[in-house]
Each structure stands twice: as structure tokens, then as C-alpha cells.
């Protein structure tokens, strides 16, 4: 006869490990007992349990409540045992010794591998700002046994580098993703993907990129000269910019205070019925936490009685 077993038994932390040991013999052969032991390179052989055909299962007190026979129905030639709630310390080599009649003794060894699934964490890097050079966008760390694989899934262009840290019973892997920040990356996902044999599917953690920027400012509203004539209503100047964080807008007049009746509403400057008093240089000041920009325009309100005058538009940042 011979023993049927496995070279390696793999189990996830906290699950039950079935240590297989089945005697495949002639029909008239019997298994008297099966002795299970842990084989430790330092401590030698340590008895785990004894499975007797007549007296049943006897478990070493060190493994009390942790070693059981598989649930019925049981084959009398099956010496397999269950190791409940596997922990990392259980990892190692195990031996079953089978005493049979009349064929004698057989033994087999197997390795128990306990997988420790990782719990990944993603840490965003420092605040990203347009104009920076290569900058850490995020780092992702996962610790497990064996070492997990940490990769990045993103459409954003960058470079990644990984390093691992070996501990007595596990390994931690840290992967960093660096990029050159640009406004086009705003809102783009950067996903850390962790793979491990103890996971049924990859673990994914997504970080949404935020890149601070402030666009150049410009002023719209002077395109139609006919709107800027004495008596006209509804004339407005609109300041155009964009940024992250969203910018705040402030309007001033270069050559004095804003005329009475001129109303500021965010990015828009609204005028009452126009008079020549509204002529002047108006400045839009755009700012966010990153930067500030200015754009100025010269408004000249035309008097229809004086057709020689033209609207002048000067924009400077």
C-alpha cells in the first residue's frame, strides 16, 4: 500500500486546514493508528494528535480544541485531521505516521502554508500644483504573507517604484506613483491594485487626483461696441478664468472707486444705464490658494452725439 497526501497544504489565515493522509492498501489491510506530529527544524518532532482505530482521537494538550477528525462519514483508512483556525505560527512541516496490519508502518510529510491576506492602505502625497516637477501623487502599502503585489491602474502618465520590507512572518510592499502635475489630471482616478494568493479578487483603492492651478484671466463684454453707448442698459463685463480650488473674483477700477450703481456679482460686473462717467480702466483680480491673476480693460462709453469716438479694448495680464 501507499499513503495519499499533499506536498503542500495552503490555507488562508483563520480558516481550517485539512491535513490529508489516506492509506491506499489491499482490501484485507487495516489501519491501526495514525500519529500526527509537527516537524520543527529547531525544536524537532512535536506530537500533535494520535488517531486510534479503537480508542479514537487523542490530541496533544497544546492543540486542545484545535485538532479534529473530518466530519462523518469517515473511511477507516483515512487518517486525515483538521487543524482549526490556522494561524501563522502553524506554518511549517507536518508528518503523519500510519501503522497498518499486516503491511507495517508508512509515513509522509507535508508543508502547511498559511496565507495572510493584506489590508492595503493608500496615502496621498503632498498637495499637487501645476508647475511642480515630478511629485509623489500617492503611495500604497500592503503587508501580507507571502509578499503581496502592489500596482497602479490609471490613465494618468507617471512613474512608479516599489520597495519591500521583510518581517519575520510577512512582508510589506510599498509602491509610489510619481507624476508631473497638470490641470488635465484633475478628477482623474489613481487606483492602487493589490494582488495576493489569499485574496479571491484584487483589492482596489482609488484616489481622485486634485491638481491646484489658476488659469490666465481675461475679460469679455467689450466685443459689441454698440452696447457701450450712453443710455444703454444691461452692459456687463465678465471675468474669465478657471482654477482648482475654484477662484474668487474681485473687481476694481484703476483710476478711482467703482462708479455708483455698478454691481459686482462674482465674476461679473453689471452696469446701470451707461453714462460717460462709466468710462475708465477696470481690473479683474482672480485668486485662489495657489496664485492670483489680473486682467484689465479700458472701457470708453460713447456718446452718440460724438460719433468720432471708438471703443478701445486693451487687455493685459
Amino acid at each position: 500500500g501507499e499513503l495519499e497526501t499533499s506536498d503542500v497544504v495552503t490555507v488562508v489565515l483563520g480558516q481550517d486546514a485539512k491535513l490529508p493522509c489516506f492509506y491506499r492498501g489491499d482490501p484485507d489491510e487495516q489501519v491501526g493508528q495514525v500519529a500526527w506530529a509537527r516537524v520543527d527544524p529547531n525544536e524537532g518532532i512535536r506530537e500533535l494528535a494520535l488517531l486510534h482505530s479503537k480508542y479514537g482521537l487523542h490530541v496533544n494538550p497544546a492543540y486542545e480544541d484545535r485538532v479534529e477528525q473530518p466530519p462523518p462519514p469517515r473511511d477507516p483508512l483515512d487518517g486525515s485531521v483538521l487543524l482549526r483556525n490556522a494561524v501563522q505560527a502553524d506554518e511549517g512541516e507536518y508528518e503523519c505516521r500510519v501503522s497498518t496490519f499486516p503491511a507495517g508502518s508508512f509515513q509522509a510529510r507535508m508543508r502547511l502554508r498559511v496565507l495572510v491576506p493584506p489590508l492595503p492602505s493608500l496615502n496621498p502625497g503632498p498637495p499637487l500644483e501645476e508647475g511642480q516637477g515630478l511629485t509623489l501623487a500617492a503611495s500604497c502599502t500592503a503587508e501580507g504573507s507571502p509578499a503581496p503585489s502592489v500596482t497602479w491602474d490609471t490613465e494618468v502618465k507617471g512613474t512608479q517604484s516599489s520597495r519591500s520590507f521583510t518581517h519575520p512572518r510577512s512582508a510589506a510592499v510599498t509602491s509610489e506613483f510619481h507624476l508631473v502635475p497638470s490641470r488635465s489630471m484633475n478628477g482623474q482616478p489613481l487606483t492602487c491594485v493589490v494582488s495576493h494568493p489569499g485574496l479571491l479578487q484584487d483589492r482596489r483603492i482609488t484616489h481622485t487626483l486634485q491638481v491646484a492651478f489658476l488659469a490666465e484671466a481675461s475679460v469679455r463684454g467689450l466685443e459689441d461696441q454698440n452696447l457701450w453707448q450712453v443710455g444703454r442698459e444691461g452692459a456687463t463685463l465678465k471675468c474669465l478664468s478657471e482654477g482648482q480650488p475654484p477662484p474668487k473674483y474681485n473687481w476694481t477700477r484703476l483710476d478711482g472707486p467703482l462708479p455708483s450703481g455698478v454691481r459686482v456679482k462674482g465674476d461679473t460686473l453689471g452696469f446701470p444705464p451707461l453714462t460717460t462717467e462709466h468710462s475708465g480702466v477696470y481690473v479683474c483680480h482672480v485668486s485662489n490658494e495657489l496664485s492670483s491673476r489680473d486682467s484689465q480693460v479700458t472701457v470708453e462709453v460713447l456718446d452718440p452725439e460724438d460719433p468720432g469716438k471708438q471703443v478701445d479694448l486693451v487687455s493685459a495680464s
Epitope: T154, E155, K157, S161, S164, V180
Partner: antibody
Framework: QVTLKESGTGILQPSQALSLTCSIS??????????VSWIRQPLGQGLEWLAD???????GYNPSLKNRLSISKDTSNNQAFLKITRVDTTDTATYYC???????????WGQGVMVTVSS | TYELIQPPSTSVTLGNTVSLTCVGD??????AYWYQQKPDQSIVRVIY???KRPSGISDRFSGSSSGTTATLTIRDAQAEDEADYYC???????????FGGGTKLTVL
């Protein structure tokens, strides 16, 4: 001025262990974001990355050679080391160390050291 | 295993422009780096992050990347540009740093 200089056993026999040293000046192995890599180039062939070691003692190895490689560092002397066990003739190559900084790979290289494995 | 593919050799007439290519599936999402190797000299990085040129590198060298191809362009090629050129990129796999096989540039 950043410089890296490799040194180590020039000639050794198959099955021996190869030990290499990278002596660094112009930057510190303690600086956050600094890593040192080992790269090799067999005669007439291309470059092959072997291993990294970083400021925080994190390490990276080429999976195809991992079980034979060991990388370490001595921050007090600003040196990085590479050990390759059980060498054979295919390990004959010029070995380089190079700096990585802040995610930017291999911005400075050493001159390289020639290693010959011969019986 | 991930590969960066470079033509083994190319040549250029003195004063002309030559483009060296590097093809890899991950290059749309990963920066390319270019290194110059001359006999008995240290390896020098000539382009980083696809298109940036380190200080001290001639402005005759430029880099670009489009899709799965990164390109190193040398204009007004000089005799001193004769060298082996290697591209490099990090692979999406966490464990590998990859070099192309290298292109030997001959200046005629």
C-alpha cells in the same frame, strides 16, 4: 558633485559569492526619496536591472534573480552593497550602481566594475 | 515578461537628424527615460520624463512619446553622438524596472 564608484572581486570561480560595494559622495543614503540601484551589463549585451535599496531600508529585487541577490547599505559610510551567491559564467558582466531620487530613475551612474566568473 | 523594443542599430550622416524609437505596451501610461553609453565612460541620462533634458545635455537631443512609442531625436548629429542608447521605463508590474535592448548609433 554626485559620484558613485563601484568596487569588488574582479575574478572569481563558479559557485562562489560575489560581493560588490558602491561608494557614494555628493548625496546621502539617508535622504528621503533616495534609492541606489545595481544594474549589470554582460559584454556586448544590454542593461539588466538587479536590485534597489532605499533610504528607509526598503528593497526591490529582479524576480528572476531574487533568490541569489542580497542588497544592503551602510549609511554611516554612505555605501551600498550587493551580494550574488552561487555565481556562474553567465554572471560575467560589468556591474554599475546608479542613483534614483524622488521617483526619477538612474540620474547618476558609476563607472562600473568588470566581474569575470571563470573556472 | 514586459519588454521595451529598440532597433539594434541605426546610422546617421554627420549633421543630419536621426530618431531612435522605443516601443512598449505601458509607455502610454509610464514615462520613458533615455541613456547614452560611450566606451569607457559613465552612462549618462540624456532625456527624462519623456521629453525633458537634464542640464549639461546638448539641446540637439530631444524626446517625445506618443502611444506605445517613445522617441529620442538627435538633430545635427555629431561624431561624439556615436554611442549605444538605452530606453528605460517602469512597468505596471510592481517588481520590474525594464531597459530596452539598446540601439547602437553610428555617425557616418
Amino acid at each position: 558633485q554626485v559620484t558613485l564608484k563601484e568596487s569588488g572581486t574582479g575574478i572569481l570561480q563558479p559557485s562562489q559569492a560575489l560581493s560588490l560595494t558602491c561608494s557614494i559622495s555628493g548625496f546621502s543614503l539617508n535622504t528621503t526619496g533616495i534609492c541606489v540601484s545595481w544594474i549589470r551589463q554582460p559584454l556586448g549585451q544590454g542593461l539588466e536591472w538587479l536590485a534597489d535599496i532605499c533610504w528607509d531600508d526598503g528593497k526591490g529585487y529582479n524576480p528572476s534573480l531574487k533568490n541569489r541577490l542580497s542588497i544592503s547599505k551602510d549609511t554611516s559610510n554612505n555605501q551600498a552593497f550587493l551580494k550574488i551567491t552561487r555565481v556562474d559564467t553567465t554572471d560575467t558582466a560589468t556591474y554599475y550602481c546608479a542613483r534614483n531620487y524622488g521617483g526619477n530613475p538612474f540620474d547618476y551612474w558609476g563607472q562600473g566594475v568588470m566581474v569575470t566568473v571563470s573556472s | 515578461t514586459y519588454e521595451l523594443i529598440q532597433p539594434p542599430s541605426t546610422s546617421v550622416t554627420l549633421g543630419n537628424t536621426v530618431s531612435l524609437t522605443c516601443v512598449g505596451d505601458d509607455l502610454p501610461r509610464r514615462y520613458a527615460y533615455w541613456y547614452q553609453q560611450k566606451p569607457d565612460q559613465s552612462i549618462v541620462r540624456v532625456i527624462y520624463e519623456d521629453s525633458k533634458r537634464p542640464s549639461g545635455i546638448s539641446d540637439r537631443f530631444s524626446g517625445s512619446s506618443s502611444g506605445t512609442t517613445a522617441t529620442l531625436t538627435i538633430r545635427d548629429a555629431q561624431a561624439e553622438d556615436e554611442a549605444d542608447y538605452y530606453c528605460h521605463s517602469t512597468y505596471s508590474d510592481d517588481k520590474v524596472r525594464v531597459f530596452g535592448g539598446g540601439t547602437k548609433l553610428t555617425v557616418l
